[in-house]
Each structure stands twice: as structure tokens, then as C-alpha cells.
């Protein structure tokens, strides 16, 4: 099943997020991703945990997963590089870089997103955008078109409370509020964008969604700038 969903959001404006990627397994949407360079998509490491024997591809330039669109193109993956410290049983270091088989054809609907390199927390309360093709309600309805939601960043101390994530949120992670509007497992690997800059990647650990006491968890890309640069080099 797809990993993740946007809850309480709405359909995104078509192709207004040209960095948005669908990481696909055997032709079906699996996870979100974000184009960070012409030939590289950033996603979540856990997305490929169960993909050992399947064919992993990346869809760029899409709004609808099923309908033909001039900008849509499916790319094979030349190389998948999970963060070396990512592990199946933790949310830490949940990043994955996918090298496309060739450089993406750039245009209005396909464009890399600048990512945050300054290792400083986003201010609590900042509204950030998260998008994905995950299911849109608790009944499991999967959208065909890209969904998005605006979420306020939550301070780490609140996120670390026992009734929230009980100390699991390290300096390399950030949280966003989850009161009915939320990202979830299936949106894993997708971008959290604040002020037009990629700040976080949706983690793919299992988590109840849409419950305000269980905020969404995002990997802070700035904390992994050295690793990202070393892989892209």
C-alpha cells in the first residue's frame, strides 16, 4: 500500500509545485519526493524498505497520477542512496537520494526546489506547505491529483512531551501541527516547504494521523547538508 496521506487538505493548483515527485514501485505511487537537482530526487529511506525486488521509478511533472499530461515523465532510477545511518526501526536519518537515469527535462512544471542549508530551526508558528498523493481520509480514499495542506511548525519541546513524541525528536527533526490537518505515512518522502525553501522531508515511521497530540515529524534537510552535497557531488 502507498506510504502516507494528506489529511484535511485540498487539491493543489496543477503544476504549481514543479519540484514534486512521485516515487513509484512497479508503476504505483509509493512515496512522495522532491527534485533537488536536475538528476536527483530526495525522499525518505524507509520508502524502499519493502521494494527490494520491485522496479523503482520517479514520476515528475505530474498533477494527476492517471491522466495524460504534457509535462509528465517517468524516470528510471540509476542509483538509490539511503542515508548510511538510517535503520528500519527508527525515524532518525530517514533520507534517501534517488539518482535519475538521466537529467530531468526542466520546464515550468519540472524544476528543482532550493533547499535549506543554514542549520537553524524554523520559527514555531511558521506556516509551511506539505503536498502528496497519499490517501485523503481515514477511510483510505486515494486521490488521483496532488493534494496539499498548510501546517504551522510546532516547537520541539512540545513535540517532545510524553503525550506527543516523548523525547524522540532530535535536533535533526522538526514537527508540524497535526490537528485534523496532517501529513502521514503515505506522504513519506514528500517536501515540507517554508517560504519557498525545502526545510523538511516527511518521515515514514508509523504514526497515527490527524491527532493533535501526535504531530507530524519531518527530517530537517539543513542538518544533512554535508551528506546531500557529498552524494550529489
Amino acid at each position: 500500500p502507498p506510504r502516507g496521506r494528506i489529511l484535511g487538505g485540498r487539491e493543489a493548483e496543477a503544476h504549481a509545485r514543479p519540484y514534486m515527485a512521485s516515487v513509484q514501485l512497479n508503476g504505483a505511487h509509493l512515496c512522495g519526493g522532491v527534485l533537488v537537482a536536475e538528476q536527483w530526487v530526495l525522499s525518505a529511506a524507509h520508502c524502499l524498505e519493502d521494494a527490494a525486488d520491485g522496479k523503482v521509478q520517479v514520476l515528475l511533472g505530474a498533477h494527476s497520477l492517471s491522466q495524460p499530461e504534457p509535462s509528465k515523465r517517468l524516470y528510471d532510477v540509476l542509483r538509490a542512496v539511503p542515508h548510511p545511518d538510517s535503520q528500519p526501526d527508527t525515524i532518525d536519518h530517514d533520507l534517501l537520494l534517488l539518482q535519475l537515469s538521466e537529467k530531468a527535462t526542466l520546464g515550468p512544471a519540472v524544476r528543482p526546489l532550493p533547499w535549506q542549508r543554514v542549520d537553524r530551526d524554523v520559527a514555531p508558528g511558521t506556516l509551511c506547505d506539505v503536498a502528496g498523493w497519499g490517501i485523503v481520509n481515514h477511510a483510505g480514499r486515494r486521490p488521483d491529483s496532488l493534494q496539499h495542506v498548510l501546517l504551522p511548525v510546532l516547537d520541539r519541546a512540545t513535540c517532545n512531551r510524553r503525550t506527543h513524541h516523548d523525547g524522540a525528536i532530535t535536533e535533526r527533526l522538526m514537527c508540524a501541527e497535526s490537528n485534523r490537518r496532517d501529513s502521514c505515512k503515505g506522504d513519506s518522502g514528500g517536501p515540507l516547504v517554508c517560504g519557498g525553501v525545502l526545510e523538511g522531508v516527511v518521515t515514514s515511521g508509523s504514526r497515527v494521523c490527524g491527532n493533535r497530540k501526535k504531530p507530524g515529524i519531518y527530517t530537517r534537510v539543513a542538518s544533512y547538508a554535508a551528506w546531500i552535497d557529498s552524494v550529489l557531488a
Epitope: 519541546a157 517532545n160 512531551r161 510524553r162 503525550t163 513524541h165 516523548d166 535536533e171 491527532n211 501526535k214
Partner: antibody, heavy 116, light 112 residues
């Protein structure tokens, strides 16, 4: 290594106030709530309240409202608790504890003795 | 406030014996998020409390596997399979699901 260092013992007169401190080290101070507990001699623990070091937001046990005031100084990574209008009933050991995970990290305790 | 009642008050044991401490809450301590925030702490003489168990049955890192927690709803138990000398002290249950959080009255584990 996470460490919470509390201020030393206090001997105070009835009606006076006292401010005790809890200095955090070994982690980012603003990433975790600070909680305060009271333990009278030979008794169990009582939760006084907690504070978010990011914005100074507090929650108090109704029992301690008007008695305890929690504050933080981010620049020195220190949490404070002021106790006012002290009586002999307030004589106890006071603990600070970091919340997350649970109360895994505690200060060593500050003994406050209220005596004329 | 949620009242946490521990029994027994005092528990004399011989080293190597099993010990069992009960904790009962005056109302269910299942949080609105579905989790149960029931914890166990050990306070040795002259020391601060130490976290042993969180969320009913999860051992905190470094806690020996002779300690185990169980229960649900309003009834909870801490078991020590083979008591060692370093286990002596006062054990407290704690609920963090409702405000204000509350501790049990304590159970003193001592040598018989």
C-alpha cells in the same frame, strides 16, 4: 551527557520567598519542557507544574497556583522556581525534571527548610 | 485529580525472590491519543527518582530485564523477577495521561 544541576539547600523564614534554580547541560535547553516536583520528608512526590523553555508558557497544578512561579533564562539554560509566602508546610525537597523521554532526567533536589 | 493507590506500602523480600507491586488509578488513564502514560520510578535513599518503565510495559534504556510492567485501564503491576540488593528503595507509579500528573504513595522494597 544530560545533567540537571540544582541550587543548594535553603533555610528561610515563614512568610519569605525563595527562588531555586535548575541548570541544564548536555542537551539543547529549549528542546524539552522542564517540570518541578515536591517531596515532603517521608512522603510521595507531587507535581507542581511545567514550563516550555521556548516561550515561557506554564502549566500549574491547581494546588500550587499562587505558591509557585516558574521561569526560564534561555541564555544560561536555567529554569527557576520561586516559592512565596512560605510556611512550614512548604518544607520539602524540590526536584526539577526534564520531560522527554518521560521523566528520565532529574536534578539532585533542593532542600527547602522553612523555620523561624 | 487522578488518585494512584499502591499496594503494599511495604514489601519485605529475600534477595533472589520475585516481588510484585500493584498500582490502581481512580479512573482510566488511557490518554485521548490512545496511549496509556503509566510509569514506574525507583527512588533509592538520598537519591532522585529513576525511570524504570514507561507506557505501562516499556523498559527505559539500561533498566535490567528482571523489571517488567503490565496492566491496562486502571490496574497496573510492576514485577521484579529476582530481587537484587541494588533494587531496594521506594517504588512509585505515576500517571501522565491527565492533568495534573500524579504519583502513587510509594512501596518500600526492603530486605526480609
Amino acid at each position: 551527557e544530560v545533567h540537571l544541576q540544582q541550587s543548594g539547600p535553603e533555610l528561610v523564614k515563614p512568610g519569605a520567598s525563595v527562588k531555586i534554580s535548575c541548570k541544564a547541560s548536555g542537551y539543547t535547553f529549549t528542546d524539552f519542557y522542564k517540570n518541578w516536583m515536591r517531596q515532603r520528608h517521608g512522603e510521595s512526590l507531587e507535581w507542581i507544574g511545567d514550563i516550555n523553555p521556548n516561550n515561557g508558557g506554564t502549566n500549574y497544578n491547581q494546588k500550587f497556583k499562587g505558591k509557585a512561579t516558574l521561569t526560564v533564562d534561555k541564555s544560561s539554560s536555567t529554569a527557576y522556581m520561586e516559592l512565596r509566602s512560605l510556611t512550614s508546610e512548604d518544607s520539602a525537597v524540590y526536584y526539577c525534571a526534564r520531560e522527554g523521554p518521560s521523566f528520565a532526567y532529574w536534578g539532585q533536589g533542593t532542600l527547602v527548610t522553612v523555620s523561624a | 485529580d487522578v488518585l494512584m493507590t499502591q499496594t503494599p506500602l511495604s514489601l519485605p523480600v529475600s534477595l533472589g525472590d520475585q516481588a510484585s507491586i500493584s498500582c490502581r488509578s481512580s479512573q482510566t488513564i488511557v490518554h485521548s491519543n490512545g496511549d496509556t502514560y503509566l510509569e514506574w520510578y525507583l527512588q533509592k535513599p538520598g537519591q532522585s527518582p529513576n525511570l524504570l518503565i514507561y507506557k505501562v510495559s516499556n523498559r527505559f534504556s539500561g533498566v535490567p530485564d528482571r523489571f517488567s510492567g503490565s496492566g491496562s485501564g486502571t490496574d497496573f503491576t510492576l514485577k521484579i523477577s529476582r530481587v537484587e540488593a541494588e533494587d531496594l528503595g521506594v517504588y512509585y507509579c505515576f500517571q501522565g495521561s491527565h492533568v495534573p500528573p500524579t504519583f502513587g504513595g510509594g512501596t518500600k522494597l526492603e530486605i526480609k
